[in-house]
């Protein structure tokens, strides 16, 4: 990809021009003494000659002017090559330099990014919840203002009539006062009559207002007599229960044998006659220690133990090493079974994986471990897996070797940074890795272009947040 | 109960290097991620280094990558931190640590001055 091109220029020097690449090279190099141009005359020191040169002396001069052309081109095919070498070394430098402090200043700003949108992340979820609860606080005051408005509203109507009654009453006795002056005694009479008849009146509504008052006390008093009978009554029943339920197992040994079963997953449940979807209790193994798990009874044969579920967003999956330890949330909705649980299960038998994807376009897709087992809290409950198949990915999201489980407050993974303070949710984090499906759940058309979502990369790229999960296990010999 | 002492450490002209070692003890060394971390005075505890369990797969600070090396020897239950290059800001306390029942185990530390 080079060029090399000579020229003369005007005052005579020999001009050289390198094209290397984008970029051209050219050197002026001044005429040896022993090397002018042939197109010049050669003027000798030594005193004019009458008669022209012998030819011999010319043949002679030239064979060393080719001479010195000779290793003129060979000089110059020397420089060529040696700035040509040149080149091509500071080239390759300034490329790698280029490239390697372009990836150094893309990581720098693409961590700066993360933290920086992390904190943003937080930040907004505080101003959100700040906002929401100012909203709120609001709409109350607008709604108690609002009913007090009314009452006011309701309150100035009855007045304006009451008003507008008494304006025509007043100007009709006027007009009545005005008119017959002189009946004006028996007028004030009959509103003295009037007067009276009001005041009987109202002495009559006082002492049925008075009756009122004594019978709602009386009725108030009878309500609690009421409610403390039927509360005697209810205690009744439940102490008859409870002593029907006693009598009854004490006489039926079959009852308290069926009670005394437990099952370790819910492949044993599955096979001890309860083919239906729902929550079970199993117990750890060699414990009488007990959890609550969803079996799932219909899924490819049935008998799988879900350890994961996400569906909704309901529960918040961003908690403590204690709380994946134990486990978190509703088994009927969204939850982590527990790391502890999981372990001891996983270490009694061989036990496969499963887990099952949903996408926002109503797409599902699968991953399938052929060998699944956690370690013990010692090595941080690293997850170990084997045999890969399914439809989403050929390559395993969850990367191997297995990682050791990380969260908020158990930083376990193999990056300088802290994957789940960044990424949220515990996981099996890498540096940070190709999933996590503990992550922030985000609704539909706000699921792209999350870097902490719910994420399984060999599926839906690295941006993408899933729209439901659920990991289950199984006995491999099911 | 897990023990990890840490050796190497010393003064060191700038451009100098120095070998860090970490021996482990009292627990499966072959099954541990293995990290290195350095202290100033009045500084947070950073990590500069760490080697996985398996594979050796390694991670590096920046301030510290294409100086610093990483190693492990599972036979002598000992990790490396080859330093090279050294400078100024690199002087330091280097703590060996290992993360077992999700907590840090430290060793004692080594000091490494690098000064001219």
């Known amino acids: 990809y080079n060029n090399f091109r000579k020229s003369m220029d005007s005052i005579g020097k020999k001009q050289y021009q390198v094209q290397h690449g984008s970029c051209s090279y050219t050197f002026l190099l001044p005429e040896m003494d022993n090397c002018r141009s042939s197109s010049s005359p050669y003027v000798s020191n030594a005193v004019q000659r009458d008669a022209p040169l012998e030819y011999d002396d010319s043949v002679q001069r030239l064979q060393v002017l080719e001479n010195i052309m000779e290793n003129n081109t060979q000089w110059l095919m020397k420089l060529e090559n040696y700035i040509q070498d040149n080149m091509k070394k500071e080239m390759v430098e300034i490329q790698q330099n280029a490239v390697q402090n372009q990836t150094a200043v893309m990581i720098e700003i693409g961590t700066n990014l993360l933290n920086q949108t992390a904190e943003q992340t937080r930040k907004l979820t505080d101003v959100e919840a700040q906002v929401l609860n100012q909203t709120t606080r609001l709409e109350l005051q607008l709604l108690e203002h609002s009913l007090s408005t009314n009452k006011l509203e309701k309150q100035i109507l009855d007045q304006t009539s009451e008003i507008n009654k008494l304006q025509d009453k007043n100007s009709f006795l006027e007009k009545k006062v005005l008119a017959m002056e002189d009946k004006h005694i028996i007028q004030l009479q009959s509103i003295k009559e009037e007067k009276d008849q009001l005041q009987v009146l109202v002495s009559k509504q006082n002492s049925i207002i008075e009756e009122l008052e004594k019978k709602i006390v009386t009725a108030t008093v009878n309500n609690s007599v009421l409610q403390k009978q039927q509360h005697d009554l209810m205690e009744t029943v439940n102490n008859l229960l409870t002593m029907m339920s006693t009598s009854n197992s004490a006489k039926d040994p079959t009852v308290a044998k069926e009670e005394q079963i437990s099952f370790r997953d819910c492949a044993e449940v599955f096979k001890s006659g309860h083919t239906t979807n729902g929550i079970y209790t199993l117990t750890f193994p060699n414990s009488t220690e007990e959890i609550k798990a969803y079996c799932d009874m219909e899924a490819g044969g049935g008998g799988w133990t879900i350890i994961q579920r996400r569906e909704d967003g309901s529960v918040d999956f961003q908690r403590t090493w204690k709380e994946y330890k134990v486990g978190f949330g509703n088994p009927s909705g969204e939850y982590w079974l527990g790391n502890e649980f999981v372990s001891q299960l996983t270490n009694q038998q061989r036990y496969v994986l499963k887990i099952h994807l949903k996408d926002w376009e109503g797409n599902e897709a699968y991953s399938l471990y052929e060998h699944f087992y956690l370690s013990s809290e010692e090595l941080n409950y690293r997850i170990h897996l084997k045999g890969l198949t399914g439809t989403a990915g050929k390559i395993s999201s969850i990367s191997q070797p297995g990682n050791d489980f990380s969260t908020k407050d158990g930083d376990n993974d193999k990056c300088i940074c802290k994957c789940s303070q960044m990424l949220t949710g515990g996981w099996w984090f890498d540096a940070c890795g190709p999933s996590n499906l503990n992550g922030m759940y985000y609704p539909q058309r706000q699921n792209t272009n999350k870097f902490n979502g719910i994420k399984w990369y060999y599926w839906k790229g690295s941006g993408y947040s899933l729209k439901a999960t659920t990991m289950m296990i199984r006995p491999a010999d099911f | 109960q897990v023990q990890l002492v840490e050796s190497g450490g010393g003064l060191v002209q700038p451009g100098g290097s120095l070998r860090l070692s970490c021996a482990a003890s009292?627990?499966?060394?072959?099954?541990?991620?293995m990290s290195w971390h350095r202290q100033t005075p009045g500084k947070e505890r950073t990590m500069v280094a760490l080697?996985?369990?398996?594979?050796?797969?390694?991670t590096y600070a920046d301030s510290v990558k294409g100086r610093f090396t990483i190693s492990r020897d599972n036979a002598k239950n000992t990790v490396y931190l080859q330093m090279s290059n050294l400078k100024p800001e690199d002087t330091a306390v280097y703590y060996c640590?290992?993360?077992?029942?999700?907590?840090?185990?430290w060793g004692q530390g080594t000091q490494v001055t690098v000064s001219s």
């Open positions: 009292g627990f499966s060394f072959s099954s541990a991620t």
């Open positions: 640590n290992t993360r077992r029942y999700n907590r840090d185990f």
């Open positions: 080697i996985a369990y398996a594979g050796g797969s390694t």
